[in-house]
């Protein structure tokens, strides 16, 4: 069961896996959740009754029964990991800890104007896990305003001490706020010859890359495939680092693959969820249980539902044996990866899907789309919403995109003259406008947040957030789209679609069925040539065919320009403005979402 509350003055006895240092019990709970085996924890807060060397210790614990005996102890705070919970989990920690010095390897020291600037520096430094900043009130003159960037093997401090007039905090890489490049490419026949910080077994290079991503010290990796000549190294995933943050040497070697940590892309691609099945593959590890199961899918479900299960191997039933049920071996290991991977034994293996909730919901694969045609099918664009106004009569006003369970991203110009959110209704999971009747459920709007710098669409900043009165329950027909990663600024998107219920020509009416059109992106230089009277800024992105013919039109405003990249859909643009509709050499102009990721996160993550 899911227990989220913390138990004050309580200590769990036994079951210790390891001890780390965290600045709060809340963060200890997050560390426990992300640890492959931790189910419970005990944190020691600062207290006069407690030995200062034990302050801020976070003891990670495991138990076969998923619980441990409780003992009363002042200053101890205990709790359970969120592994047992079904809700979305994030490692993002924006808290700043006053008068705490988080110890680690101080590898960079520089002057910063503020703790925020220091945190930004840490977030944009590939090695940085956390920082300590000496404020301008710090007693030692030469250390004032000094920003120390730190890293450790575990990503958590090696110790935490009280120190007046300093503040500490963590890198915000896990909050999608890093400007570091997001390099998704996997390089075949390549070995990165840098120092290994760890090695694990993995079934393929993609899993290896995802493991590297959530390993605190891993910056890049090399994976030896099952065809690698040296048998003892087959399926070996080497997690690597270097001082520069980049591989120093690349060696051409057949049957090896290399790539980079996806820490700067983690909010727009799955990094925890290993959802594939590996046929004719056996995962070895500590056996947790052996259960009868009808299929490998059923076995994966059993593993996902067993909180301690990390991976599984399913052996299909021998003809008519055991009511056609095979054996499902539920397994675990100290690091969450198989201790060995064997091939040719007929097993089907895979991983728990419990970790998928640590990934952004937007990375979930949606059903295959129908190619060709202009009318969409149900569930094809599950993030698309229709925004209605009830004044003077109810009608479709604009499109919008679900980006969170309480948030719609749309265009600011949709709210021309709108004084109150009370007249707005958001309908999700809609294909045809005719589905909307008086009794159709909708989301009321609690707040309209328009970008402070917005004046008119053509001047830019044409972006707005709608905070919904109630939360959206994600289903196949209504789910979020990923925001682009800031590290993806240089990605060239080639599979982009504009969707909406807008006019199909200049003098027309709102369409009943959601329309779609594949439209190529146009460079800003090219776009500027087509709009001499306007300033096309880097905060705008353009899309259209030179000959015209396909474009957004009236009623499409606020809707998404969705681009598929590495199997994940990203909200690249918001339909904003254009000269006419689908005119020759007049591309549509869209709000360039990647330039507003900070603004979006600031508004949606505000307390």
């Amino acid at each position: 069961e899911c227990v989220t509350q913390l138990l004050k003055d309580t200590c769990f006895e036994g079951g210790d896996i390891t001890t780390v240092f965290t600045p709060s019990a809340k963060y200890c709970q997050v560390v426990c959740t992300y640890h492959p085996r931790c189910l419970l924890f005990t944190f020691t807060a600062e207290s006069p009754s407690e030995d200062p060397t034990r302050w801020f210790t976070c003891v990670l614990k495991d138990s076969v029964t998923e619980t441990l005996p409780r003992v009363n102890r002042t200053a101890a705070i205990s709790g359970y990991s969120f592994k047992q919970c079904s809700h979305q989990i994030s490692a993002c920690n924006k808290d700043i800890y006053v008068d705490l010095d988080m110890k680690g390897i101080n590898y960079n020291s520089s002057v910063a104007k503020s703790a925020q600037e220091c945190q930004e520096r840490c977030t944009d430094d590939v090695h940085c896990h956390f920082f300590t900043y000496a404020t301008r009130q710090f007693p030692s003159l030469e250390h004032r305003n000094i920003c120390l960037l730190k890293h450790t093997q575990t990503g958590t401090p090696t110790r935490i001490t009280k120190l007046d007039k300093v503040v500490s905090g963590f890198s915000l890489k896990s909050c999608a706020l890093s400007n570091l490049a997001c390099i998704r490419d996997i390089f075949p026949n390549t070995v990165f010859a840098d120092s290994n910080i760890d090695s694990v077994m993995a079934p393929d290079a993609f899993v290896c890359g995802r493991i590297c991503t959530h390993h605190p010290g891993c910056l890049f990796f090399t994976f030896f495939s099952q065809e690698w000549p040296k048998e003892s190294q087959r399926n070996l995933c080497l997690l690597k680092t270097s001082e520069s943050g980049l591989p120093s040497t690349r060696i051409k070697k057949s049957k090896a693959l290399s790539g980079f940590s996806l820490q700067s892309c983690r909010h727009s691609i799955p990094v925890f969820c290993h959802s594939s099945f590996y046929h004719d593959t056996d995962f070895l590890g500590e056996e947790l249980d052996i259960v009868a199961a009808k299929s490998h899918e059923a076995c994966q479900k059993l593993c996902t539902n067993a909180v301690r299960c990390q991976f599984f191997t399913y052996t299909p039933a021998q003809a008519s044996c055991n009511e056609g049920k095979g054996k499902c071996y539920l397994k675990l290991s100290s690091n969450g990866s198989p201790t060995k991977i064997l091939h040719g034994r007929g097993g089907i293996s895979g991983y728990t899907l419990r970790l998928c909730k640590m990934d952004n919901e937007c990375t979930t694969k949606i059903k295959p789309r129908i190619v060709g045609g202009t009318a969409s099918v149900r569930g094809e664009w599950p993030w698309q919403v229709t925004l209605h106004t009830t004044s003077p009569t109810q009608r479709h006003l604009c499109g919008g995109s679900i980006i969170g369970n309480q948030w719609i991203l749309t265009a600011a110009h949709c709210f021309y003259g709108v004084e109150s959110p009370k007249i707005l209704r958001v309908y999700s999971g809609i294909l045809n406008q005719s589905e909307i009747k008086e009794d159709t459920s909708f989301f009321g709007v609690q707040e309209i947040i328009i970008h402070d710098q917005y004046k008119m669409a053509e001047s830019g900043y044409d972006i707005a957030l709608l905070k919904l009165e109630t939360t959206v329950n994600y289903t196949d027909s209504q789910r979020p789209i990923c925001l682009p990663s800031k590290g993806d600024r240089n990605v060239i998107y080639t599979d982009c679609w504009v969707t909406g219920w807008g006019y199909r020509k200049l003098r027309d009416k709102i369409q009943n069925t959601l329309q779609k059109a594949k439209i190529p992106l146009v460079t800003n230089e090219e776009c500027q040539k087509r709009y001499r009277g306007h300033k096309i800024t880097h905060k705008m992105i353009c899309a259209g065919y030179r000959e015209g013919g396909k474009d957004a039109c009236k009623g499409d405003s606020g809707g998404p320009l969705s681009c598929k990249h590495n199997e994940v859909w990203h909200l690249v643009g918001i339909t904003s403005w254009g000269e006419g509709c689908a005119q020759r050499e007049r591309p549509g102009v869209y709000t360039n979402v990647v330039e507003y990721v900070d603004w979006i996160l600031e508004k949606t993550q505000a307390v």
Epitope: P392, L397, C398, A411, A412, H413, C414, F415, Y416, G417, V418, E419, I450, D452, Q453, Y454, K455, M456, A457, E458, G502, L506, A552, C553, K554, G555, D556, S557, G558, T575, S576, W577, G578, G580, G588
Partner: antibody
């Protein structure tokens, strides 16, 4: 509630500079999205938009009069000003200030009549 | 500049009847969501009063006998049923781009 009130000299001589003041209450020009425009109307004729000032001191002018117009504001005193240089009889009109947020001109002042005459 | 042409220049309508005023723009005043066309009423010695914004939305406190329609370049204001109090000048105005411009006006009288 929102109110705006224009004030001006009443009569101004040709080639002189006309200074107008718009005093308002019920809103602040430091609020994001807020702006105030000047619009004029010669007697018995149509309306001409002249200039607009935004909360962030960004300004817009009617290109046909741009060289003669200067709009400014004093946010703390809730006032917007318009200066028109080198006036002539064609500038005789009722001058209105109007509030424009992220929408239309929803609130107008009563207007002030300005006559250009020697 | 976007030029707005109103027609007719003047109009006389009987009590209870329908009055229709047209406004044509020299180029589209639509963007991908909104028709940036507004309508104002002005009585002698008074400032203009907002009637309709974004082509069809009623201004605050405006009676429901006023309605607006249109998109792109062609717009109209309808008053039905005509009342004595509706005798005034009516102006259309575009908010699509600077310079914001007004139509020449239509004088509505009681027949």
């Amino acid at each position: 509630q929102v109110t705006l009130k224009e004030s001006g000299p009443g009569i101004v001589q040709p080639s002189q500079t006309l200074n107008l003041t718009c005093s308002f209450s019920g809103f602040s020009l430091s609020t994001s999205g807020m702006g105030v425009s000047w619009i004029r109307q010669p007697s018995g004729k149509g309306l001409d938009w002249l200039a607009h000032i935004y909360w962030d001191d960004d300004k817009r002018y009617n290109p046909s009069l741009m060289s003669r117009l200067t709009i400014s504001k004093d946010t703390s005193r809730n006032q917007v000003f318009l200066m028109i240089t080198s006036v002539d009889t064609a500038d005789t009109a009722t001058y209105y200030c109007a509030r424009k947020g992220r929408g239309p001109f929803a609130y107008w002042g009563q207007g002030t009549l300005v006559t250009v005459s020697s | 500049d976007i030029v707005l042409t109103q027609s007719p220049a003047s109009l006389a309508v009987s009590l209870g009847q329908r009055a229709t005023i047209s406004c044509r723009a020299s180029e589209s005043v639509d963007n991908y969501a909104i028709s940036f066309m507004n309508w104002f009423q002005q009585k002698p010695g008074q400032p203009p009063k907002l009637l309709i914004y974004a082509a069809s939305n009623l201004g605050s406190g405006v009676p429901a006998r006023f309605s607006g329609s249109g998109s792109g370049t062609d717009f109209s204001l309808n008053i039905h049923p005509m009342e004595e109090d509706d005798t005034a000048m009516y102006f259309c105005q575009q908010d699509k781009e600077v310079p914001w411009t007004f139509g020449g006006g239509t004088k509505l009288e009681l027949k």
